[in-house]
């Protein structure tokens, strides 16, 4: 419904004055001599949120960011002469802006920064539990960035550390040209994509990376990478923008002649996000901005949830689509893709394809091969000539959950929470901006589960300036959000049932999962409680049915549009 | 020095069985793909099979499949070639062969396998 | 199937010559190409590995060029015990096959 998706109102729209007013929201607005506040880390274990920034890493309580611990890891003032004598800006660039911090083992988190255009990484001890409040530093340690961080404070890492070695997909090198996907630290020799061929990376914009598992064997674990690319010349007519989603073998050490210390199992595939235009022509939403994966009671089966934003200047949108990974293994399954033809198109490989398929993660489930060191090299050759799927990877239901075309903002971040509600499980997505504000948005099932309406339940404004929303993390345990900035980082509670009314229709009408008329106010719903007291409905909004006290006198018509 | 020694060769009426061997030695047997291939009286270099390094998986060209299986026992450092259903066709010395993930780079000095009625 | 074609099938030269032996590929295949020499009565032995790799023990007059589907071996000086068939294989894709070979022969 895609009238109801770009013209959806808000329920509540919250300014950042009423936000903190009502309490809504706790604001860390950052120190003098930092900025940057991109890269989240959430502990829930020790009630932690790790945030690198520009030449400082904070530990803040999960509870009141207000108490919070810092590092301050600037780079020498050598390396800062250095990087300002190589043209580069002394305040925007040439300092240590925290790319990746993620947890190394159960006592310490590693860190890589920019480093002045000179990339570094540490360990940060952080303890074994939570009242030993260590957080700090290991400066006698320190280890070269490259293939970790970016050189350039603008670029971002999508990385992944598991089993003691870090996976990122980053630019390599000082000019940032050279993007590839990179395994290093651990013990075995590092792994990357072909370098300088286009087929495999053209310039990417790296947005996260994944660990999904492919069976019960953890031989074939996957990683899968986000990012978004330049099409391929003859892909698409003109310069365009595809979003990507690529995998890896987590057990892949390279070929043996060919492709040595580079990925063998290397593929990826196109995101589909778009909507049918009036004139034929699809409309598509291209610019990869986000992705967050929801986990489901099949470890192998998250829903992928992305955001998209149009790559037109003329027509600014942004759009919210699901895939399952059932129809992305599909894709990887499928035909490559594959130039031929007297202009040169890409089309789908029709020729032989050699065992064991590439892409295939070697291991006992498939047939006795080892080590991708093992493999024939007619595998290695087709892997190093066909990185790409023929077909793309269309979401669920074939278009967006959510679409926002008339606005004068953009989607930048996305978190989900799947809540139990009265009438069954709803995802609600928090969607942030580049104007520093977060949609609280419900995926509400019409006639079939298929069939999703959004129900727009709050426009909140987090941040005292319009900033650009870089990084989200929601905390189930404290039921709490996370938002980082340029500026800064806000905390805010998942639900506000109170400001929903006084009166049982306001409350079912707001059709919000987290909250319920408990017979006296409009409270948090929690689904062991006394169900029948509780009042809520969520696919329909409809009081008359659920509120028996007749209470629907609290003026349905109002919007309760706060200015 | 890597030595493969073949045997099991022989006379053997078309439709007959004959199951060839190759002892290995000089090199660690179980860490290479070992390949079989042909060579008819007067004739040219036929590739037959290569099996990978942990025995799991092999590779036959059409002439062959389903009538010849490579197999291996990393244990005893032997490849074996297993013919069923023989042609006169067939008929040529079997080199065991050290490769076939890549070049083939030792071979044995062959077996000959005769068939004929 | 990749079909190989060696020329010329039959080469006649004397020792100290130059030798040059050819082999064409039925498509591109990169540099997965490998030369084997066959004495009467012998098996074959490892020449050059992927179009231009040397093998250890081979001798340095033995070279190998080329890639795509055109390559090459040379022999800078032939020695009288160089005379035999040569044999090109390329390794790109299964089935692997043979070239029908080229024989060199005392002039």
């Known amino acids: 419904n895609y009238a109801n998706g770009k013209n959806n109102v808000p329920r509540l729209k919250l300014s950042y004055k009423e936000m903190l007013e009502s309490n809504n929201v706790i604001t860390f607005n950052g120190l003098a001599n930092s900025s940057s506040y991109h890269t989240f880390l959430l502990d829930e274990e020790r009630s932690r949120l790790y945030v690198g920034a520009k030449d400082h890493i904070f530990s803040f309580n999960l509870v009141n960011i207000k108490d919070f611990q810092k590092i301050v890891w600037p780079v020498s003032y050598t390396r800062r002469d250095e990087c300002k004598w190589a043209g580069k800006d002394i305040l925007k660039e040439c300092a240590n802006f925290i790319k990746v911090l993620k947890a190394y083992n159960q006592t310490h988190l590693y860190a890589c920064g920019t480093g002045a255009f000179h990339p570094i990484c540490t360990y940060i001890e952080v303890g074994h539990h939570p009242e030993d409040n260590i957080f700090k530093l290991q400066d006698s340690h320190f280890e070269n960035g490259r293939g970790k961080s970016p050189y350039d404070p603008k670029l971002l890492t999508a990385s992944l550390l598991i089993d003691g070695e870090l996976y990122s997909g980053t630019a390599a090198d000082f000019m940032g040209r050279d993007f590839a996907i990179f395994r290093t630290l651990g013990h075995h020799h590092p792994i990357r994509t072909e370098q300088h061929d286009s087929r495999w990376l053209n310039d990417p914009r790296f947005i996260s990376a994944h660990l999904i598992p492919e069976s019960d064997n953890p031989e074939d674990d996957k990683v899968y990478f986000f990012f978004r690319e330049n099409a391929i010349d003859g892909e698409h007519s003109g310069k365009a923008t595809h979003a990507r989603i690529g995998q890896i073998c987590k057990n892949d050490f390279g070929g043996h002649r060919s492709l040595v210390n580079k990925w063998t199992t290397f593929l990826k595939a196109r995101l589909i996000c778009s909507v049918p235009g009036p004139n034929g022509i699809d409309t598509h939403f291209d610019e990869l901005q986000d992705v967050f994966l929801m986990n489901s009671k099949d470890p192998k089966n998250p829903i992928v949830y992305g955001v998209f934003t149009t790559s037109s200047n003329i027509f600014k949108g942004s759009a919210v689509c699901m895939y399952s990974m059932s129809d992305v293994r599909r894709v990887f399954l499928g035909p490559y893709a594959h130039r031929d033809g007297p202009n040169y198109q890409w089309v789908p490989y029709q020729g032989r394809v050699p065992y064991p398929r590439p892409g295939t993660c070697p291991s006992k489930t498939f047939g006795g091969f080892d080590s991708t060191k093992d493999l024939p090299d007619d595998v290695i050759t087709f892997a190093r000539s066909h990185p790409a799927m023929y077909n793309p990877v269309f979401p669920i239901n074939n278009r967006p959950i959510m679409i926002k075309t008339d606005v004068n903002y953009q989607f930048t971040q996305i978190v989900v929470d799947r809540v139990d509600a009265e009438d069954g499980q709803y995802d609600v997505m928090f969607i942030g901006t580049d104007v520093g504000t977060v949609l609280k948005v419900v995926s509400v099932p019409k006639e079939t589960w298929h069939d999703l309406e959004e129900v727009l339940l709050e426009e909140m404004t987090v941040f005292r300036e319009p900033t650009t929303i870089s990084a989200m993390e929601l905390s189930t345990k404290q039921q709490q959000l996370y938002i980082g900035s340029t500026a800064g980082v806000a905390q805010l509670p998942l639900h506000r049932c109170d400001i929903y009314g006084k009166a049982c229709a306001e409350c079912c009408l707001a059709r919000d999962p987290y909250c319920a008329w408990d017979g006296s106010s409009c409270s948090r719903y929690f689904p062991t409680a006394k169900a029948r007291t509780r009042a809520q409905d969520i696919r329909n909004g409809d009081p008359l049915t659920h509120c028996s006290d007749g209470g629907i006198e609290g003026r349905m018509d109002h919007h309760h549009h706060h200015h | 020095e890597v030595q493969l020694v073949e045997s099991g060769g022989g006379l053997v009426q078309p439709g007959g069985s004959l199951r060839l061997s190759c002892a290995a030695s000089g090199f660690t047997f179980s860490s290479y793909y070992m390949s079989w291939v042909r060579q008819a009286p007067g004739k040219g270099l036929e590739w037959v099979s290569t099996i990978i390094k942990s025995g799991g998986y092999a590779y036959y060209p059409d002439s062959v499949k389903d009538r010849f299986t490579i197999s291996r026992d990393n244990s005893k450092n032997t490849l074996y070639l297993q013919m069923s259903s023989l042609r006169a066709e067939d008929t040529a010395v079997y080199y065991c062969?050290?490769?076939?993930?890549?070049?083939?780079?030792?071979w044995g000095q062959g077996t000959t396998v005769t068939v004929s009625s | 199937e990749i079909v190989l074609t060696q020329s010329p099938a039959t080469l006649s030269l004397s020792p100290g010559e130059r030798a040059t032996l050819s082999c064409r590929a039925s498509q591109s295949i990169g540099d997965y190409l490998h030369w084997y020499q066959q004495k009467p009565g012998q098996a074959p032995r490892l020449l050059i590995k992927y179009a231009s790799q040397s093998i250890s023990g081979i001798p340095a007059r033995f070279s190998g060029s080329g890639s795509g589907t055109d390559f090459t071996l040379t022999i800078t000086s032939l020695e009288p015990e160089d005379f035999a068939v040569y044999y090109c294989?390329?390794?790109?894709?299964?089935?692997?096959?043979f070239g029908g070979g080229t024989k060199l022969e005392i002039k």
């Open positions: 294989q390329q390794g790109y894709s299964f089935p692997y096959t």
């Open positions: 062969v050290r490769g076939g993930q890549g070049a083939m780079d030792y």
